[in-house]
């Protein structure tokens, strides 16, 4: 039950995280004009990964796309790439994790297959989250560098008579959305990996052999050892005591470890 909950929660957290990464990637407010020197500006500038916008106090907003690839800074291209890779990995991870969910039955999919898929999606979510966090952090670092550079050259004037104020940019809302979303995706991925441990079957399901003793019938099931994945705890042989004898075909599959967690 707890494994199912962990897996489900991991999936939901990752889903929210990936939705956030997509939202952050599409948002225009990656960097916003620093209003420290002029808090009552009539023109407010902000920039995204794909376009830059200007909002006038009149209410008019004008956005212009970056219609060049070669003319864009390499760092911006790198951030775009990281965010897109994060989205793609996250989307694939979501697709895989849907089939891996314990609450969803697809044919006669083995628990081991579901465990592997859960692990795969978990790793994908972790990498996706790391890509988003890295992308946002690279952009933030770029902003900090430019901020201090523009502060150093804040005013350039002609004989001190005419002031040309350089527009400085600071962290936009998208950065915080990206950091939070990346973190959630990462947490979701970790949860999926934890759930994988519990999903992995503890023993190989051999057919049970019935031993007909003279007194009362006891059905034994030998405990098989799981392949060493590093996720299982020490397995123990389990006995099921039954009131009457059962044939081979009547022997039911035994509860897995995760049902007792």
């Amino acid at each position: 039950m707890a494994v199912t909950a962990c897996q489900g929660l991991g999936f939901v957290v990752s889903l929210i995280g990936i939705a956030g990464i997509i939202a952050a990637t599409c948002m225009d407010q990656w960097s916003t004009q620093d209003l420290y020197n002029n808090p009552v500006t009539a023109v407010f500038n902000y920039q995204g990964l794909w376009r830059s916008c200007v909002r006038e106090s009149s209410g008019f907003t004008e956005c212009r796309g970056y219609f060049t690839l070669l003319g864009l800074p390499a760092m911006l291209q790198a951030v775009r790439a990281l965010m897109i890779v994060g989205i793609v990995l996250g989307a694939i991870g979501l697709l895989v994790s849907i089939f891996a969910l314990k609450c969803i039955r697809i044919g006669s999919m083995e628990d081991s297959a579901k465990a592997n898929m859960t692990l795969t999606s978990g790793i994908m979510f972790i990498v996706s989250g790391l890509c988003a966090i890295a992308g946002v952090s690279v952009f933030a670092n770029m902003l900090v560098t430019n901020f201090w550079m523009s502060t150093a050259n804040m005013y350039t004037g002609m004989g001190g008579m005419v002031q040309t104020v350089q527009t400085r940019y600071t962290f936009g809302a998208a950065l915080f959305v990206g950091w939070v979303a990346g973190g959630l995706t990462l947490i979701g991925g970790v949860m999926m990996c934890i759930a994988c441990r519990g999903l992995a079957p503890e023993e190989t399901n051999y057919k049970a052999v019935s031993y007909h003793a003279s007194g009362h019938s006891v059905a034994y099931k030998p405990g098989g050892f799981k392949a060493s994945t590093g996720f299982g705890s020490n397995t123990k042989n389990k006995k099921i005591y039954d009131g009457g004898a059962r044939t081979e075909d009547e022997v039911q599959s035994y509860p897995s470890k995760h049902d007792y967690v």
Partner: antibody
Framework: DVQLVESGGGLVQPGGSRKLSCAAS????????MHWIRQTPEKGLEWVAY????????YYADTVKGRFTISRDNPKNTLFLQMTSLRSEDTAMYFC???????????WGQGTLVTVSA | DIVMTQSPSFLTVTAGEKVTMSCKSS????????????LTWYQQKPGQPPKLLIY???TRESGVPDRFTGSGSGTDFTLTVSSVQAEDLALYYC?????????FGAGTKLELK
């Protein structure tokens, strides 16, 4: 057709109060920022106050800050300017204007004259 | 505050003549975000409110005759009337539309010889 009609002007004693109104028609009033601008032969055109379409933010000229209050009633398509502690230098023709592209004023009212005198 | 300086204060012209008036700002009105200059020109005739002529330094308002042209960038701007008509005789104001407080120039009065 866009129309802005100011009212409420007149003779006021120094230290007195006055409330100006601007009735708007011919456009979606709630969708535009609005301004009060005044004009005197000595000072020319002087921007007084601004109120955004949703009533926030609001900005004032330093000369009127703390004495004048701009407000709007979107359902009634009306802009207001409450003036208190009036001084002789507040004597002017007061215009209301609509904010437009490029932070320009595309439509102005005919103005209402406020005279502050003993 | 951005100070707007207009020159000359008076311009005496004859009908059909080309005329230019200047407006200088104490601070650049060029916005780096969209490369637009936030300067506006108005025309005011006696007993009337100002009328918008040009915004973004060079964009003509609809209905404004094409003999009116705005130009310039940064801190230096010009309004040109290619062929002055009798109805163009008025006061012309430039306005800082870049930051609050929105400030106006003292105006240039266009008069007939």
């Amino acid at each position: 057709d866009v129309q802005l009609v100011e009212s409420g002007g007149g003779l006021v004693q120094p230290g007195g109060s006055r409330k100006l109104s601007c009735a708007a028609s011919g456009f979606t009033f709630s969708g535009f920022g609005m301004h009060w601008i005044r004009q005197t032969p000595e000072k020319g055109l002087e921007w007084v106050a601004y109120i955004s379409s949703g009533s926030r933010p609001i900005y004032y000229a330093d000369t009127v800050k703390g004495r004048f209050t701009i407000s709007r009633d979107n359902p009634k398509n009306t802009l207001f300017l409450q003036m208190t502690s009036l001084r002789s230098e507040d004597t002017a023709m007061y215009f209301c204007a609509r904010f437009y592209y490029g932070n320009s004023f595309d439509h102005w009212g005919q103005g209402t004259l406020v005279t502050v005198s003993a | 505050d951005i100070v707007m300086t207009q020159s000359p204060s008076f311009l005496t012209v004859t009908a059909g003549e080309k005329v230019t008036m200047s407006c200088k700002s104490s601070q650049s009105l060029l916005n780096s975000g969209n490369q637009r200059n936030y300067l506006t020109w108005y025309q005011q005739k006696p007993g009337q409110p100002p009328k918008l002529l040009i915004y973004w330094a060079s964009t003509r308002e609809s209905g404004v005759p094409d003999r009116f042209t705005g130009s310039g960038s940064g801190t230096d701007f010009t309004l040109t009337v290619s062929s002055v008509q009798a109805e163009d005789l008025a006061l012309y104001y430039c306005q800082n539309a870049y930051s609050f407080p929105l400030t106006f120039g003292a105006g240039t009065k266009l008069e007939l010889k």
